[in-house]
């Protein structure tokens, strides 16, 4: 599994009610960590294993720097405003972090944004910096000149993010390292006269990334899918939906394919006729192929025009097969 | 350059009539983070809803989700309510109990 | 361990040039900067310009430009300073050292001095 | 440039007594990335001089803890706790903050 570590800075040259006019974020993976803002001018933990596990020293030590940070951040923006010779509302936003890849190599950036928009870029290989417009460029000449500093933020990256992140992934390990399947129901919905959509959907899973394919008669179809992207549920998990339109005359044989760490899915559309519905699971080497009469991992519901196939990997038991 | 938000409104379990649930509404790919959520039932600001802390994506661009307790039922309708900058008129995206 | 070790004492005439070296030994070469320092007899420590033998980008001090010249050679883990047009205010000792690597942000290891006399 | 200003020249002590050397920097050298590059260096007569410490506070390694670095923003301050016979010699601060990097121009520590 990969995992990234992220700190990411905003300053707003309009402050709001919800905004004020600097923010400092952390996050492991999609996890929040840290926090700190002009406001509360305080670093406090986002998550409860990051509060339990580092010490109030470490909170103080981090709070006086973040101090500086935001001095220096603000006027970093007041300076580019001068430059492009804007007022109003602007936005300069800076991104630093590394990713931990499953196969043990890394990853590190750092880069700059304003207004939104890519402003500079870190190269930690090459040690320079990309400039995205005439005023980066004057910010790129000054910064490659000192060389420490290109040094530390190298370093930083390569060595230091790196270790960071492995002692926070430790520190997160139930949370993170975590693993929840899906639940995966098809459903079938006449959306307009003639028009008949099979929608696939998975709820309850960690971590967020899933793969979900639509196939039709055992070849994945590309067109005419629509996809409700991976949203968050609030609770720690996350849910998604592919649907596709599709002529109810047809003959054609829909079926749901989801992947989530290395646990296949297959659930078949329900049709209206036929009385056996299969749901497969492949994880390793073990095939589970389910028959809808007294199982109770299906349900097969008649409500309306809807229909209904559920997968609930809860109640499976695969034995000693990886999963 | 303003970017508008996208709004998506769905519930955190299968809804079932009657059946106490969440209703999250998630505004993502928004800039600047300068922005407004309300939820509404039957088109009435709901008072009671919780917010997270803006959060920042790798495109620079933010997000947010709100949340309320909600029951739903047959007749009655949900929706969430966005005011941006990068919009002339607040959007109001409803809850579609298929999606 | 760790060494910096310098080119000995060059003695040279005004108008000429020279160029000092500076071995380094028991470390990753190109993960460190490389630092030169100037020191007139009797005087104090005066920063020349740094070189990052990886990236083989370089920084001076302005009131050196167009005097020292750095460059760096990673297939034999030397660094050079070449100095032009030499007058009696360059008559001093130079040093190099190396700077910081992850946690030791400082001029850990320096080179023992090369001695620069500009003498007609 | 950033100008760093040493005081005093030169500090004569007894064995054993307190010495403490100042550094002013002309400019904050806190950098962007909320470093302070501010070391303090000891060099003996005939020698190539030697890191006591680093990032204001940390001492090198090896360098006896009697030798503390405090300070921020643009005041810096070196503190022998009991000097003794091995500590003659003349310190410099250096600021590696903003280029050009800068050193100070020396405090040379000997017998009253």
């Known amino acids: 599994r990969t995992h990234s570590l992220r700190y990411f800075r905003l300053a707003v040259s309009d402050p709001g009610p919800v905004v004020p006019e600097f923010i400092s974020v952390g996050y492991v993976d999609s996890h929040p960590i840290t926090t700190y803002d002009s406001v509360t001018r305080q670093k406090e933990p986002k998550a409860p294993w990051m509060a339990e596990n580092l010490a109030p020293d470490h909170w103080e030590r981090y709070t006086q720097l973040l101090r500086g940070w935001q001095q220096t951040f603000k006027a970093e923006l007041r300076h580019l405003q001068r430059h492009y010779n804007h007022s109003g509302l602007h936005t300069y936003q800076r991104m630093i972090g590394c990713e931990l890849l499953e196969d043990g190599s890394t990853t590190g950036f750092l880069q700059y944004a304003y207004d939104g928009q890519d402003f500079i870029i870190f190269n930690k290989d090459t040690l320079s910096w990309l400039a995205m417009d005439y005023v980066a460029h004057i910010t790129k000449q000054a910064w490659e000149a000192n060389l420490h500093e290109l040094q530390y933020q190298k370093n930083w990256l390569e060595e230091e993010c790196i270790a960071w992140l492995k002692r926070f992934l430790e520190y997160g390990r139930d949370t993170l390292e975590r693993t929840e399947h899906p639940v995966v129901r098809t459903t079938r919905k006449e959306t307009f006269p003639g028009i008949t959509t099979f929608f696939c959907r998975a709820h309850g899973f960690y971590p967020p990334e899933i793969s979900m394919t639509w196939m039709k008669n055992g070849e994945e179809i590309a067109q005419e899918v629509d996809y409700g992207g991976v949203l968050p549920s609030g609770d720690g998990t996350y849910q998604t939906w592919l649907s596709v339109n599709l002529d109810p005359q047809s003959n054609d044989v829909y079926s749901c394919h989801v992947e989530h760490c290395g646990r296949q899915m297959v659930l078949e559309a329900p049709r209206e006729s036929g009385d056996i519905l299969r749901v497969s699971t492949i994880s390793g080497t073990t095939i589970l192929i389910i028959a809808l009469a007294g199982v109770g991992v299906l349900i097969w519901r008649r409500s309306q025009e809807l229909k209904e196939v559920m997968y609930q990997p809860t109640q499976v038991n695969e034995g000693s097969s990886p999963s | 350059i303003q970017k508008t938000p996208q709004i998506q409104v769905y519930s955190r379990h299968p809804p079932e009539n009657g059946k106490p649930n969440i209703l999250n509404c998630y505004v993502t790919q928004f800039h600047p983070p300068h922005i407004e959520i309300q939820m509404l039932k039957n088109g009435k600001k709901i008072p009671k809803v919780e917010m997270s802390d803006m959060s920042f994506s790798k495109d620079w661009s933010f997000y947010i989700l709100a949340h309320t307790e909600f029951t739903p039922t047959e007749t009655d309708t949900y929706a969430c309510r966005v005011k941006h900058a990068s919009m002339a008129e607040p959007k109001t995206v409803y809850w579609d109990r298929d999606m | 361990q760790v060494q910096l070790q310098q080119s000995g004492t060059e003695l040279v005439r005004p108008g000429t040039s020279v160029k000092v070296s500076c071995k380094a030994s028991g470390y990753a070469f190109s993960n460190y900067l490389i630092e030169w320092i100037k020191q007139r007899p009797g005087q104090g420590l005066e920063w020349i310009g740094v070189i990052n033998p990886g990236s083989g980008g370089i920084s001076y001090n302005e009131k050196f430009k167009g005097k020292a010249t750095l460059t760096a050679d990673k297939s034999s883990s030397t660094a050079y300073m070449q100095l032009s047009s030499l007058t009696s205010e360059d008559s001093a000792v130079y040093f190099c050292?190396?700077?910081?690597?992850?946690?030791?942000?400082?001029?850990?290891?320096w080179g023992q001095g090369t001695s620069v006399t500009v003498s007609s | 440039d950033v100008l760093m200003t040493q005081t005093p020249l030169s500090l004569p002590v007894s064995l054993g007594d307190q010495a403490s050397i100042s550094c002013r920097s002309s400019?904050?050298?806190?950098?962007?990335?909320?470093?302070?590059?501010l070391d303090w260096y000891l060099q003996k007569p005939g020698q190539s001089p030697k890191v006591l410490i680093y990032k204001v506070s940390n001492r090198f390694s090896g360098v006896p803890a009697r030798f503390s670095g405090s300070g921020s923003g643009t005041d810096f301050t070196l503190k022998i706790s009991r000097v003794e016979a091995e500590d003659l010699g003349v310190y410099y601060c250096?600021?590696?903050?903003?280029?050009?990097?800068?050193f100070g121009g020396g405090t040379k520590l000997e017998i009253k």
């Open positions: 050292a190396r700077w910081g690597y992850l946690y030791y942000y400082t001029m850990d290891h």
């Open positions: 250096f600021q590696g903050s903003h280029v050009p990097y800068t």
């Open positions: 400019q904050s050298i806190v950098q962007g990335s909320g470093n302070t590059f």
